[in-house]
């Protein structure tokens, strides 16, 4: 079953970076994605988050899995360069975590690097991961263009890893140079689309909040997702089924610092892509251990 952590999520407001720790098992769908691009000299390395949808599939943001070596075209990283860690809580202790390599990396064909429209991607794992209290899928939303309603509260978790000067082993086993060793989370309200759009249009630049995005955060700032949390799931508790549903993926924000006043985080609106996700996964709804909330 999807979207049912073995621990119930407490309704505390915490900051991802510098905030209090999440308890192990609170976000059993949370994946750490490590990309080591060794295709050209020198190697490149970065991190992101994702969400487990089934034993074999991870949902994330396309920009996490795109090689920045190309700016004119969208080139996905090679599957050989992707490692996914599940059941990870403290990056200094990988003993309870499951790591998997990628069998496929699928970027949305319309992903636009200029405005991050269609910022969604999937990773198919080489081997199905065993599910348990710390590794469980999140639910996909229903197909609905409106997305989450304004002012609804959602949760986002992340380690906020952004320092590249570390080996994968250092990241996973010691974590000494990460922004947060232990998974953090924050509770954020969905912002009305018009308000967010206006907020970005008032800034000079090519910032476009499309219908495939929604925003979350506080006008006064102070709580936000940030670099290194990219691709992580913005989850909302579905009232009817009492399951956690991935409504958003950490996509972009700015131009000011994370957590600045009236700078909302922008998330990919997952509900616009449910059909695309199922199509890539090759399973009709309900056949995978995850699923869509009914």
């Amino acid at each position: 079953e999807c979207g049912q952590p073995s621990r119930s999520l407490p309704s505390l407001v915490k900051r991802i970076i510098g905030g209090r720790n999440a308890e192990p098992g609170l976000f059993p769908w949370q994946a750490l994605i490590v990309v080591e691009d060794t295709s050209r000299v020198p190697n490149d390395k970065w991190f992101g988050s994702g969400a487990l949808l089934s034993e074999s599939w991870i949902l994330t943001a396309a920009h996490v899995l795109r090689s920045q070596r190309r700016d004119t075209t969208v080139i996905p990283v090679s599957k050989e360069h992707v490692t996914v860690y599940l059941g990870l809580h403290d990056v200094r202790d990988k003993s309870g975590a499951v790591n998997s390599s990628a069998a496929r990396v699928v970027l949305h064909p319309d992903f636009n690097i200029q405005n991050y429209n269609h910022d969604i991607a999937l990773v198919q794992l080489q081997e199905p991961v065993p599910l348990g209290p710390h590794v469980m899928p999140v639910c996909l939303p229903r197909l609905e263009p409106e997305g989450p309603s304004p002012h609804m509260l959602g949760l986002v978790a992340g380690w906020g890893i952004s320092n590249p000067n570390v080996t994968v082993d250092e990241i996973i086993s010691s974590g000494t140079r990460t922004l947060s060793d232990v998974l953090q989370y924050v509770k954020l309200p969905v912002v009305p689309h018009a308000e967010c759009k206006t907020s970005y249009e008032s800034r000079s630049g090519n910032y476009s909040v499309t219908e495939n995005m929604f925003c979350a955060g506080y006008y006064e700032g102070g709580k936000d997702t940030c670099l290194g949390d990219s691709g992580g799931a913005f989850v909302i508790l579905d009232d009817l089924s009492q399951r956690w549903v991935v409504q958003g993926l950490v996509s972009w924000g700015g131009p000011e610092e994370c957590g600045s006043k009236q700078v909302y985080g922008v998330y990919t609106k997952v509900s616009n892509y449910v059909d695309w996700v199922w199509e890539q996964m090759g399973s009709p709804q309900g056949r995978a251990p995850g699923g869509t909330v009914s």
Epitope: W46, I75, W252
Partner: antibody
Framework: QIQLVQSGPELKKPGETVKISCKAS????????MSWVRQAPGKGLKWMGW????????TYADDFKGRFAFSLETSARTPYLQINNLKNEDTATYFC?????????WGQGTSVTVSS | DVLMTQTPLTLSVTIGQPASISCKSS???????????LNWLLQRPGQSPKRLIY???KLDSGVPDRFTGSGSGTDFTLKISRVEAEDLGVYYC?????????FGGGTKLEIK
């Protein structure tokens, strides 16, 4: 509008260090790498390398390994080029350009003069 | 490193007349992803460079359609159908296929 605004001209002595900034605005900063290009007086353009603004990993062309360092202050949307142990032959205008390979927008250039 | 050779070194053209610049690379610029990362830029006197063309033939926004780029493999050409006064400056080709990226030596376009 997309802008790259570089720091002002520098006059340095041999052996000193210079750090040039390139403030980016008007686009999703971590979406594009940032290249650095050198232009010696009356000469053509030479690509020095680039920095991945998402990962922070720099890539240097062979001629610019050692004394040259690219860095980032992501929250300020600002890449930096630092040149250590300056030599007379480092006298040039240094440009930042958006993109690891695209180089579609350029800063106004920073003139560095090295003279004893 | 890939050597980029531009000809001519200087081009003296009357306003309203066509102009053509050649750029040859020492190896094919066709990348494994099927794209050819050959670009052109213009550096007007005393200004920073401005990209005109990318991926051989795609015009950047705001670039007049009197500019066209063509070619494949190792041979590329930038053509201006009717030169205008604002076109003067130094034109550079550069390749982004093989690391490190390399520029041509430049072609100075003068107005007769």
């Amino acid at each position: 509008q997309i802008q790259l605004v570089q720091s002002g001209p520098e006059l340095k002595k041999p052996g000193e260090t210079v750090k040039i900034s390139c403030k980016a605005s008007g686009y999703i900063f971590t979406s594009y790498g940032m290249s650095w290009v050198r232009q010696a007086p009356g000469k053509g353009l030479k690509w020095m390398g680039w920095i991945n603004t998402y990962s922070g990993v720099p890539t240097y062309a062979d001629d610019f390994k050692g004394r040259f360092a690219f860095s980032l202050e992501t929250s300020a949307r600002t890449p930096y080029l630092q040149i250590n142990n300056l030599k007379n032959e480092d006298t040039a205008t240094y440009f930042c350009a958006r993109g690891g390979e695209a180089m579609d927008y350029w800063g106004q250039g920073t003139s560095v003069t090295v003279s004893s | 490193d890939v050597l980029m050779t531009q000809t001519p070194l200087t081009l003296s053209v009357t306003i309203g007349q066509p102009a053509s610049i050649s750029c040859k690379s020492s190896q094919s610029l066709l990348d494994s992803d099927g794209k050819t990362y050959l670009n052109w830029l213009l550096q007007r006197p005393g200004q920073s460079p401005k990209r005109l063309i990318y991926l051989v033939s795609k015009l950047d926004s705001g670039v007049p359609d009197r500019f066209t780029g063509s070619g494949s493999g190792t041979d590329f050409t930038l053509k201006i159908s009717r030169v205008e006064a604002e076109d003067l400056g130094v034109y550079y080709c550069w390749q982004g296929t093989h690391f490190p990226w390399t520029f041509g030596g430049g072609t100075k376009l003068e107005i007769k």
